[in-house]
């Protein structure tokens, strides 16, 4: 006899990175017929939802109208069909951004490089933080961590055209509270210099569409919640 139901999927809309004072919805998708969903935050019960009618609904939403550092952290959800509970979902790391200050991002040896050149990003923030995060915009949120007193180096090593794209960095005050994003830095990697076509292989977006990027990133992954779950889950490990 089955003791538990399959674990639900958990994700955040529009994104797991939420600017402070902005809204976010945590989604939990289980099975049709689930009579109760529980959202847990940092290991404790945070909210309950009982869908009506349960046989027509397999997803619930927990709305956070005003994101702040107290709401940032690890979320998971479970659901119940009759008396049988599911396994807990993977952990969702919900991050509050736009805290305190804005770092500056620079790229060495410059924004235009040749395939094979060694590239390093530098993220600098003069306030009290020792962890930095470098993100490449695009369909998947590639995140690297770096450490340093006021700046961190992110060596990409010899680059290929796959490194083309727009990068931003954040200072991290703790795992779930990040600074404002830096201004974007666009890296152009030329494979064959004779052919200076610079169309990036990952979709990238202009400086003023960071919000759109976040939405696009999430939308792209909504089709596969497992992938998004995995991305979010591994982001801060």
């Amino acid at each position: 006899q089955q003791q538990t139901l399959p674990k639900p999927f958990i994700w955040a809309e529009p994104h797991f990175m939420v600017p402070k004072e902005k809204q976010v919805t945590i989604c939990c998708q289980g099975n049709y017929g689930a009579v109760e969903y529980q959202l847990h935050f940092e290991g404790s019960l945070f909210a309950v939802d009982r869908p009506k009618p349960p046989e027509r609904i397999n997803k619930v939403q927990f709305y956070i109208p005003d994101m702040n550092s107290r709401m940032a952290g690890q979320y998971s959800c479970i659901y119940r069909v009759g008396e049988l509970w599911s396994e807990p979902s993977n952990l969702l790391d919900l991050v509050v951004t736009e805290m305190y200050d804005t770092p500056t991002l620079s790229v060495h040896p410059g924004p235009e490089v040749i395939s094979g050149e060694k590239v390093t990003f530098y993220c600098r923030l003069d306030t009290a933080t020792s962890m930095f995060l470098l993100l490449k915009e695009g369909r998947s949120s590639h995140v690297q961590r770096g450490y340093g007193k006021v700046q961190a180096e992110f060596p990409l090593g010899p680059v290929t055209t796959a490194h083309r794209g727009t990068y931003r960095c954040f200072g991290s005050y703790n795992n779930h509270a990040w600074s404002f994003p830096s201004e974007p830095v666009k890296l152009l990697v030329t494979g064959d210099i004779e052919n200076t076509s610079l169309a990036p292989e990952d979709p990238t977006f202009p400086a003023d569409t960071w919000g759109t990027y976040l939405l696009t990133t999430e939308t792209g992954l909504q089709k596969d919640h497992a992938l998004w779950d995995h991305t979010a889950q591994n982001l801060l490990r």
């Epitope: 500056t104 991002l105 620079s106 060495h108 040896p109 410059g110 235009e112 490089v113 040749i114 094979g116 050149e117 060694k118 530098y122 600098r124 700046q151 030329t190 210099i193």
Partner: antibody
């Protein structure tokens, strides 16, 4: 067009310091690394170091770490290099140069530093 | 640091000549080799980057070749305005390093 303007010459006494300037125009000053290079008569160029104006990150040649200090003034798009405890070995032409694309593609005219009592 | 060696410190040639200047690196620099021209008045210009790519505005009589540790700059039809000192520079590893220069004179 891209321009890097440097004063022509500086005469300084041994043991003193000198601050060389390089005023940039024609490109986004904060986005590109400013390099400084030394050229002594009859010798090759020596790379001193570089600075990125956006956040002041620097890389130095180990040989010049105690000799040169690189700074920038973003408001005037000017880069500076201070040379300290000058000796006759520091008499040289000093160039500022930037990499806009794939190499050091724009150079200043150079400042000739003469260290003499 | 990577050592860059230009074995010929000076070179005499006639106008119209084909001139080749060589440069050797102390280790493989993966084609990240640039050539610069310093005119007698001190002006410095980039000629060639990434071994063989002509910088914009540089006459096509200049060309570069090489791989691994050995590189060369060729001027196919020497003109009066080419009288200068030529330096190679590796951009593969920090710190960037330069050759000692080859001074080109007219016979």
């Amino acid at each position: 067009q891209v321009q890097l303007q440097q004063p022509g010459a500086e005469l300084v006494k041994p043991g003193a310091s000198v601050k060389l300037s390089c005023k940039a125009s024609g490109y986004t000053f904060t986005s590109y690394w400013m390099h400084w290079v030394k050229l002594r008569p009859g010798q090759g160029f020596e790379w001193i170091g570089e600075i990125i104006p956006s956040n002041g990150v620097t890389n130095y040649n180990e040989k010049f770490k105690r000799k040169a200090t690189l700074t920038v003034d973003k408001s005037s798009s000017t880069a500076y290099m201070q040379l300290s405890s000058l000796t006759s070995e520091d008499s040289a032409v000093y160039y500022c140069t930037i990499r806009l694309r794939y190499a050091l593609d724009y150079w200043g005219q150079g400042t000739s530093v003469t260290v003499s009592a | 640091d990577i050592q860059m060696t230009q074995t010929t410190s000076s070179l005499s040639a006639s106008l119209g000549d084909r001139v080749t200047i060589s440069c050797r690196a102390s280790q493989d620099i993966s084609n990240f080799l640039n050539w610069y021209q310093q005119k007698p008045d001190g002006t410095v210009k980039l000629l060639i980057y990434y071994t063989s790519r002509l910088h914009s505005g540089v006459p096509s009589r200049f060309s570069g070749s090489g791989s691994g540790t050995d590189y060369s700059l060729t001027i196919s039809n020497l003109e009066q305005e080419d009288i200068a000192t030529y330096f190679c520079q590796q951009g593969n590893t920090l710190p960037p390093t330069f050759g000692g220069g080859t001074k080109l004179e007219i016979k």
